[in-house]
């Protein structure tokens, strides 16, 4: 068997496929490592762009399974990031394996909006929660920079009604409609027998990426009667 | 909607101190929704961050007022507090409150209160 002081000074291995990934702006590096006959260490390191004097920051140190959580390293989650990791084994080092640059607010997930539907008088009523990342709550785990441009600019609501489609924009920015809660949006209804369908997605301000869309609600107006 | 009232500001000498604070107030306003911040602007200058804490509480400065100014919040009072120590003439400015909503990114802006540092 293998041991450490037969490895050579390049003989430690380097990381591969170094990716980030992240859901409602919690990134996770993850890496792959070659099967070693002693156990690696892995050290992830950090640097944001944007930040004066930016250096490498310790984000994990010294673990040993194939992933880290690098929220707590984002400051500003429109702002370029990038990634670093080097294994050790022993007293030896890796080279750095690099990612390639991340914004968390650009290249991650968003989850969807929650939507609420009711019929009031001669229209219905949409109530778009905005997505849990951007309100308080138990889900809400990350904290970044407040003058992060990382937030909702407009909602395209999808409406479809006895098969066929409308598209709808609420503009967040718009105080009749919305606040930092929800925003809402009514749509005048037929007195025919209709079903309507309504699903949402927020885009994002400054790149348009869409959060995930919303389950589908359906509501069905027989009259002036209701069912949900 | 959301109104911000600044209070305190004034004349003060190099080297003192002065406290701003900044009412929030609205229907909808709560400062988990909202991240809190103050700005200033001398004359013939940008607009610039000095202090800003986020919804959850996490406080962010200006390198220039880093040690000097601290900035805080009582919830129960919808109030947000600037302490400015160890003032420098150069920091005579108008300091703006702002909310920033955290979904929206929508602005809210105070009167502006006048600091006057003298030497």
């Known amino acids: 068997e293998m041991g450490t002081a037969d490895l050579g000074p390049s003989s430690v291995p380097t990381p591969t496929n170094v990716t980030i990934e992240s859901y409602n702006m919690n990134p996770i590096v993850y890496w792959e490592y070659q099967i070693m006959p002693q156990v690696p260490v892995f050290t992830v390191e950090v640097k944001n762009y944007g930040v004066k004097n930016s250096e490498w920051i310790d984000a994990c140190i010294n673990i040993s399974h194939h992933y880290c959580n690098i929220s707590d390293h984002v400051g500003d989650p429109s702002n370029s990031l990038w990634v670093r990791v080097k294994a050790r084994v022993g007293q030896k080092e890796s080279a750095y394996a690099k990612s390639e640059e991340f914004a968390v607010c650009r290249d991650g997930k968003i989850g969807p909006p929650k939507l609420d539907i009711r019929k009031e008088e001669k229209q219905i009523m949409i109530d778009i929660f905005h997505p849990s990342v951007f309100v308080n709550g138990d889900e809400q785990e990350v904290d970044y920079d407040p003058e992060t441009t990382c937030y909702i600019r407009v909602y395209n609501v999808y409406v479809r009604m006895n098969g066929s489609e409308i598209q709808y924009k609420i503009l967040t920015q718009k105080e009749d409609d919305c606040d930092e809660i929800q925003c809402q949006l009514a749509i005048p209804v037929s007195s025919l027998n209709s079903q309507y369908c309504v699903s949402a997605e927020g885009v994002l301000h400054v790149w348009g990426v869409t959060t995930e869309k919303s389950k589908e609600v359906c509501i069905t107006i027989f009259n002036s009667s209701i069912k949900g | 909607q959301v109104q911000l009232q600044q209070f305190g500001g004034g004349l003060v000498q190099a080297g003192g101190s002065l406290r701003l604070s900044c009412t929030a107030s609205?229907?909808?306003?709560?400062?988990?929704?909202?991240?809190m911040g103050w700005y200033r602007q001398a004359p013939g200058k940008q607009r610039e961050r000095v202090a800003s804490?986020?919804?959850?509480?996490?406080?962010y400065y200006s390198d220039s007022v880093k040690g000097r100014f601290a900035i805080s919040r009582d919830t129960a009072r919808n109030t947000v507090y600037l302490q400015m120590n160890s003032l420098e003439p150069e920091e005579t400015a108008v300091y703006y409150c702002n909310a920033r909503g955290r979904a929206t990114g929508r602005d809210y802006w105070g009167q502006g209160t006048l600091v006057t540092v003298s030497s």
């Open positions: 804490i986020s919804s959850r509480g996490s406080t």
């Open positions: 609205g229907s909808t306003f709560s400062f988990s929704n909202y991240h």
